[in-house]
């Protein structure tokens, strides 16, 4: 029909100009469309250059929409991570501050002379929580071994205790249980609590990382063509008012995001495991009551050592022989004051409950993020048709969209009518991210059972008082803690917000 040939390109001109492109490219009226490589080759208002520009623009717009959706999810995960991380670190810092404030008065030189050992223990716990490759049980055992050496010397200043005698003392330690049940209790509870806390926070970090990396995966050329056809070919073909048919849009985006949808199963597994591990935040071995109460076990341990001093000394002498007496040394130490214990169970502050309930709700909300992405983008970003089925843009003309909607994931795109997807070539970045999700899920499942996945051989029995028998590789750094320069000034180690004194830790 000659009349249709001379239809004006005014609407296309307006839309094209609004996108920032030069209007000189746009024909005044429709032209023959044999030159079109993506859109159907009927009469058109688009030149080759316009088609190329709009194809690039539609590709960029989809990538931007994808990044925007990812950014929202990333921001949510980052906020969660920061909130939990702040809370867990606050619990540990609080415990250390309490120790620094109360132990000098409660234990005198038994604390001040060993302040460095306590500082180092908290530093190691912090490092472990942050993901350092430390064996927590051995870290604790080594701490107790070192502390025993130091305290035994302090409780017997009249004795000459050379290194070989201290080595012997260390070998006896496990059988003697010098610190009572505190080391074992702390080890069992702290291992479970720290493993749960750190794996949960790591889970949030991995989830966020996966989203960030997947958002950077480029869309392939076949996807670009399909998106151009979906978004701008209606304009080129003179039906700019026709919006894409919903099922047509879903098929295009399911094809474009086929690899991303394959994240779904492992993503759900990860989020389920994260929700599950929050069960370990409560109760006597829970994160809140354990991490915030490390100092109470330390106090119990020192008290137990003082209470058992005479029995312990007798058994050590029995096992290691009579040490020499320093003729110029002071007499045996007087019985020390008994450190008053703070209540073991920290009353829950309510902060963690609030954090957990928010996190659970938000994690449930994003469980189907990857498979709902095509639908979300279509409904939120693609201005879908709400008209009756035969009035929407189907990729060829205004009319009904007949093909069925494809399933989710790469394998289901074998017959996608809109995007040619090679199902034999999965995207390697996304496969790597699926593997990261699997690994993190295994960590969380392991953590749920109280195990650190890096140290599956860790046994759950024994006293935990430490052997002191030589030096386990990389685990002997819990060393002497001397007092600050005046024996009257207890050493308070620098934490954010605390003033630095001489002899303090400096960051």
């Amino acid at each position: 029909d000659p009349a249709s040939k001379s239809r004006s390109c005014g609407e296309v001109r307006q839309i094209y100009g609004a996108k920032g492109f030069s209007l000189s490219d746009v024909p005044q009226a429709e032209i023959s469309g044999e030159h079109l490589r993506i859109c159907p080759q009927g009469y058109t208002c688009c030149t080759s250059e316009m088609e190329e520009n709009l194809a690039n623009r539609s590709h960029a717009e989809l990538e931007t929409a994808l990044r925007d959706s990812s950014r929202v999810l990333q921001a949510m995960l980052a906020t969660q991570l920061r909130s939990f991380d702040d809370h867990f670190q606050h619990l540990l810092n609080d415990s250390e501050r309490t120790l620094q404030a109360t132990f000098p008065g409660a234990f005198g030189e038994l604390y001040t002379q060993n302040a460095r050992a306590f500082r180092d223990l908290y530093s190691e716990l912090r490092l472990y929580y942050r993901g350092a490759n430390l064996h927590l049980e051995e870290t604790l055992a080594e701490f107790w071994a070192r502390l025993l050496e130091r305290l035994f010397k302090q409780l017997h200043p009249q004795l000459l205790l050379p290194d070989d005698y201290l080595d012997c003392l260390g070998k006896q330690a496990e059988a003697l249980r010098p610190f009572g049940e505190a080391p074992r209790e702390l080890r069992l509870r702290a291992t479970r609590a720290f493993v749960a806390a750190r794996s949960f926070v790591q889970g949030l970090g991995v989830a966020s990382d996966v989203v960030r990396k997947v958002a950077q995966v480029p869309l392939g050329p076949e996807c670009s063509r399909a998106v151009m056809k979906l978004v701008y070919c209606a304009h080129c073909l003179g039906v700019p008012g026709a919006r894409p048919c919903p099922d047509y849009c879903r098929n295009v985006l399911k094809g474009c995001l086929a690899n991303q949808a394959d994240l779904d199963a492992e993503w759900r597994n990860l989020l389920d495991s994260m929700v599950l591990i929050t069960d370990k935040f409560w109760g006597t071995s829970g994160v809140e009551s354990v991490i915030g109460s490390v100092h109470t076990w330390l106090a119990e341990a020192i008290n137990a050592l003082q209470d058992n001093r005479d029995t312990l000394t007798a058994k050590v002498i029995q096992g290691c022989g009579n040490p020499k007496v320093n003729p110029q040394g002071p007499g045996p130490e007087e019985k020390r004051r008994r450190g008053k214990l703070a209540p073991r169970e920290r009353p829950p502050s309510g902060t963690l409950e609030k954090l957990v309930s928010e996190a659970k709700a938000q994690l449930r909300d994003v469980q189907d993020f990857w498979i709902s992405l095509p639908g979300t983008l279509c409904s939120e970003k693609m201005a879908l048709s709400t008209a009756s089925d035969d009035r929407c843009w189907n990729g060829m003309a205004r009319g009904r969209y007949l093909p069925e909607v494809m399933g989710d994931g790469l394998a289901n795109q074998i017959n996608n009518p809109e995007v040619e997807v090679d199902i034999t070539k999965p995207d390697m970045t996304i496969r790597q991210q699926i593997m990261q999700l699997k690994i993190m899920t295994n960590r969380l499942r392991s953590a749920y059972n109280g195990n650190d996945v890096d140290f599956q051989d860790a046994s759950d029995d024994g006293s935990g008082s430490g052997s002191g028998d030589g030096c386990l590789d990389d685990l002997c750094s819990r060393k002497v803690s001397r007092k600050s320069s005046s024996s009257r000034t207890p050493l308070t180690h620098a934490l954010p917000g605390l003033s630095e004194q001489e002899g303090q830790k400096t960051s």
Epitope: Q113, A117, R119, D120, S123, E124, L127, R146, E149, R150, K153, P157, L160, L161, P162, D163, L166, N326, G329, P330, C471, D473, D474, L475, C476, S477, R478, K479, V480, R482, K483, S484, S485, S486, S487, L491, E502, G503, K505, T506
Partner: antibody
Framework: QVQLKQSGPELVKPGASVKISCKAS????????MHWVKQSPEKSLEWIGE????????TYNQKFKAKATLTVDKSSSTAYMQLKSLTSEDSAVYYC????????????WGQGTLVTVSS | DIVMSQSPKSMSMSVGERVALSCKAS??????VSWYQQKPEQSPKLLIY???NRYTGVPDRFTGSGSATDFTLTISSVQAEDLADYYC?????????FGAGTKLELK
């Protein structure tokens, strides 16, 4: 056997900085605190500070807090000390020293690094 | 800071003589005192720790004694190879401090 090998002598200009190293071998580097000691003819031995290679925690002698910065590189089992704003008073031999066990007793010493500050 | 005072500054001895080097702390340091030997052009070497424990490989002519504020390093029979500077140091409190040293010379 335990060895601490320090970097060679340094001749530096006043106001400059210098970073000296101490490479440890023969033991678990992160297992023992590393200390730094200054020896000058006038002041005999002066303790500068210590670092826990496992955690990076440091403790300084107040006198050297603005002068020295202690760091470690765990991957190469090396401890470092940077001295800044050097003056002739900083001319000395600097030693790294490792504790015997957990008692602030230095059983192992590096061979020393002579730092000369001169214009 | 705890001040460690050594005396005498130097002493001349003959081989075979007994020598006692003194170290006094400005405040109680328990038995947290070590003794170091430094020969010319060498690094210091540990002799005694914990005021009176001889370190591995140190000849038994070296003996440490004392506690609280008064400490002594005794060489029962001086040998030619003992010509060196001797330093005491305390590890009781921060900052760790050393004495100014005693130079042992041979007559």
């Amino acid at each position: 056997q335990v060895q601490l090998k320090q970097s060679g002598p340094e001749l530096v200009k006043p106001g400059a900085s210098v970073k000296i190293s101490c490479k440890a071998s023969g033991y678990s580097f992160t297992g023992y605190y590393m200390h730094w000691v200054k020896q000058s003819p006038e002041k005999s031995l002066e303790w500068i500070g210590e670092i826990n290679p496992s955690t990076g925690d440091t403790t300084y002698n107040q006198k050297f807090k603005a002068k020295a910065t202690l760091t470690v590189d765990k991957s190469s089992s090396t401890a470092y000390m940077q001295l800044k704003s050097l003056t002739s008073e900083d001319s000395a031999v600097y030693y790294c020293a490792r504790e015997k066990r957990d008692d602030g007793v230095f059983a192992y010493w590096g061979q020393g690094t002579l730092v000369t500050v001169s214009s | 800071d705890i001040v460690m005072s050594q005396s005498p500054k130097s002493m001349s001895m003959s081989v075979g003589e007994r020598v006692a080097l003194s170290c006094k702390a400005s405040e109680n340091v328990g038995t947290y005192v070590s003794w170091y030997q430094q020969k010319p052009e060498q690094s210091p070497k540990l002799l005694i720790y914990g005021a009176s424990n001889r370190y591995t490989g140190v000849p038994d002519r070296f003996t440490g004694s004392g506690s609280a504020t008064d400490f002594t390093l005794t060489i029962s029979s001086v040998q030619a190879e003992d010509l060196a500077d001797y330093y005491c140091g305390q590890s009781y409190s921060y900052p760790l401090t050393f004495g100014a040293g005693t130079k042992l010379e041979l007559k």
